[in-house]
Interface confidence: low
């Protein structure tokens, strides 16, 4: 138990150092000024406190700074930065990116995506936006990590700033995050030549429109089925057979290997057969030949 | 010793409001978030809100966000807590209470507590 | 809103027994709760935060647990001064809530 008792004299601590880790937690808890830890929080790191140990600093700082630690103390809290829980980390206002670099470098191992992501979040609204220094940051300490903000943080993003994007820096984010995301990548990327653009663009398609995909098709850019998986349900579903073959191009037949699953799935439904069987994959569950197709929601907005 | 003082009873009419006060000695004011819970008979306790006395900050339960207005005097360490339009339902012990040591939103010292008592 | 559910409203006990309050979160609020103790006619008092950790000054014979979203509060050697009504509270988000609060009778 984490209590207040007094301290022994001879126990008095005058500089946080090694000597610490022969205390018990009643005496940590009784003989460490909260101020004087806060003062000397870059040698924490150094000292091999146990997480218990770790657990009564915690409980100084928390107790000194009730409102959230200040960043000089923050920069400095090593492995106490696994201590913290998303709801401490709200609490901070952070703007530097060195203190961003030392806490990821921290996290790196550990089942903290929940706190990262919190910390993320803190940098952002500290510095106002997520500026190119802070992609460049993430992208270099924390590969995934700009999926971990909410696309209203995405936001802020300038599309100046999205060519420091790379592929892999997008492998988790949502469609909500690319539907934000994908306006501004074609907005940078707007003066490249066709296949330059495409290759550039190609990460961001999750959040591209039916209107986007279909131009894609026009542009013989032989899009691979990763790519055309992550597209979404809704810019798929109007593509035409002759569409999908111009934009997969010799990557078509990877239809058959995705047939089961969704938007190919959806998007067969939505196919004539005879269409289908164009394609010469044997690609099944198109609408047969001879049935006449009634678009119910046209039929019910006329009633 | 840390003490939050409130004075004991208010009597209002219905409609009416109130300004409740809580004195705070033996600590450093501004140091700790207040908070303020309401307690009827029978019915458990209810937290309405609490107030940063650094800086006014607040966070309000949406159940009590046209009822209560929390604000602090630095100078004389003392919180406050104004309820409007009163009514029978707003008849409760209402206390101020100090935000636990390190820095959680649990409630290490609690007030005298103030019955206020609607009533014509 | 998080619900802090305490099923018993009313608990029995006999001095020198050993008896257990529980409250359960609609919710996971990870370890964070408290346990606070109101006597008749008193103002409340902190017990137990962070579900397990005893707040200064508070015997030994009160502890805090969790497992999961289920929170326990032990009494054990119950004296007669625990006659009270015992409430836990999560401080995992807004709003804060208590639960409804269990009293203590000593036969």
């Known amino acids: 138990d984490v209590e207040r008792t007094t301290c022994p004299p001879e126990k008095e601590v005058h500089e946080i150092d090694e000597s610490l880790i022969f205390y018990k937690k009643r005496e940590l808890e009784a003989c460490v000024d909260a101020a004087l830890l806060a003062a000397q929080m870059d040698r924490v790191d150094a000292i091999p406190f146990t997480y218990e140990q770790l657990d009564v600093l915690k409980h100084k700082l928390d107790e000194l700074y009730p409102q959230g630690y200040p960043e000089s103390v923050i920069r400095h809290l090593g492995h106490l930065f696994l201590k913290m829980s998303p709801e401490d980390i709200r609490k901070w206002n952070v703007t530097s990116l060195e203190t961003l670099k030392a806490l990821l470098k921290v996290s790196k191992g550990h089942e903290m995506s929940a706190q990262v992501a919190t910390l993320i979040d803190r940098v952002v609204v500290g510095r106002g936006q997520l500026d190119k220094d802070t992609v460049d940051t993430l992208t270099a300490f924390c590969p995934g990590c700009l999926c971990s903000l909410s696309p209203e943080r995405l936001s802020s993003v300038p599309p100046s700033v999205i060519g420091a994007v790379r592929p892999q820096d997008l492998d988790t984010c949502g469609p909500r995050q690319l539907d934000v995301l994908y306006p501004k990548a074609r907005l940078a990327f707007q003066n490249m030549s066709g296949s330059e653009y495409f290759v550039k663009i190609r990460p961001f398609l999750g959040g591209a429109p039916t209107e986007d995909v279909k131009a894609l098709s026009q542009q013989n850019v032989s899009m691979d089925l990763a790519t055309f998986m992550k597209l979404r349900r809704e810019a798929v579903l109007p593509l035409t057979v002759a569409e999908v073959q111009k934009l997969l191009g010799p990557h078509v037949e990877g239809l058959k290997v995705e047939e089961q699953h969704s938007p190919v799935r959806d998007w067969i439904l939505k196919q004539r057969q005879d269409d289908l069987d164009t394609l010469g994959l044997g690609l099944q569950g198109g609408i047969p030949n001879g049935y006449l197709i009634l678009d119910l929601s046209v039929r019910e907005a006329l009633s | 010793q840390v003490q939050l003082q409130q004075p004991g009873t208010e009597l209002v009419k219905p409609g009416a409001s109130v300004k409740l006060s809580c004195k705070a000695s033996g600590y450093t004011f501004t140091s700790y978030w207040m908070h303020w819970v309401k307690q009827r008979p029978g019915q458990g306790l209810e937290w309405i809100g609490n107030i940063n006395p650094s800086n006014g900050g607040t966070n309000n339960n949406e159940n009590f966000k046209s009822k209560a207005t929390l604000t602090v005097d630095t100078s004389s360490s003392t919180a406050y807590m104004q309820l409007s339009s009163l009514t029978s339902e707003d008849s409760a012990v209402y206390y101020c209470?100090?935000?636990?040591?390190?820095?959680?939103?649990?409630?290490?010292?609690w007030g005298t507590g103030t019955t206020v008592t609607v009533s014509s | 809103d998080i619900v802090m559910t305490q099923s018993q409203k009313f608990m029995s006990t006999s001095v020198g027994d050993r008896v257990s309050v529980t409250c359960k979160a609609s919710?996971?609020?990870?370890?964070?709760v408290a346990w606070y103790q109101q006597q008749p006619g008193q103002s409340p008092k902190a017990l137990i935060y962070?579900?397990?950790y005893r707040y200064s000054g508070v015997p030994d014979r009160f502890t805090g647990s969790v497992s999961g979203t289920d929170f326990t509060l032990t009494i054990s050697n119950v004296q007669s001064e625990d006659l009270a009504e015992y409430f836990c509270?999560?401080?995992?988000?807004?709003?804060?809530?208590f639960g409804g609060g269990t009293k203590l009778e000593i036969k």
């Open positions: 919710q996971n609020v990870g370890t964070n």
């Open positions: 209470v100090r935000n636990g040591y390190h820095g959680y939103w649990y409630f290490d010292v």
């Open positions: 962070s579900a397990s």
């Open positions: 509270q999560q401080y995992n988000s807004y709003p804060l809530t």
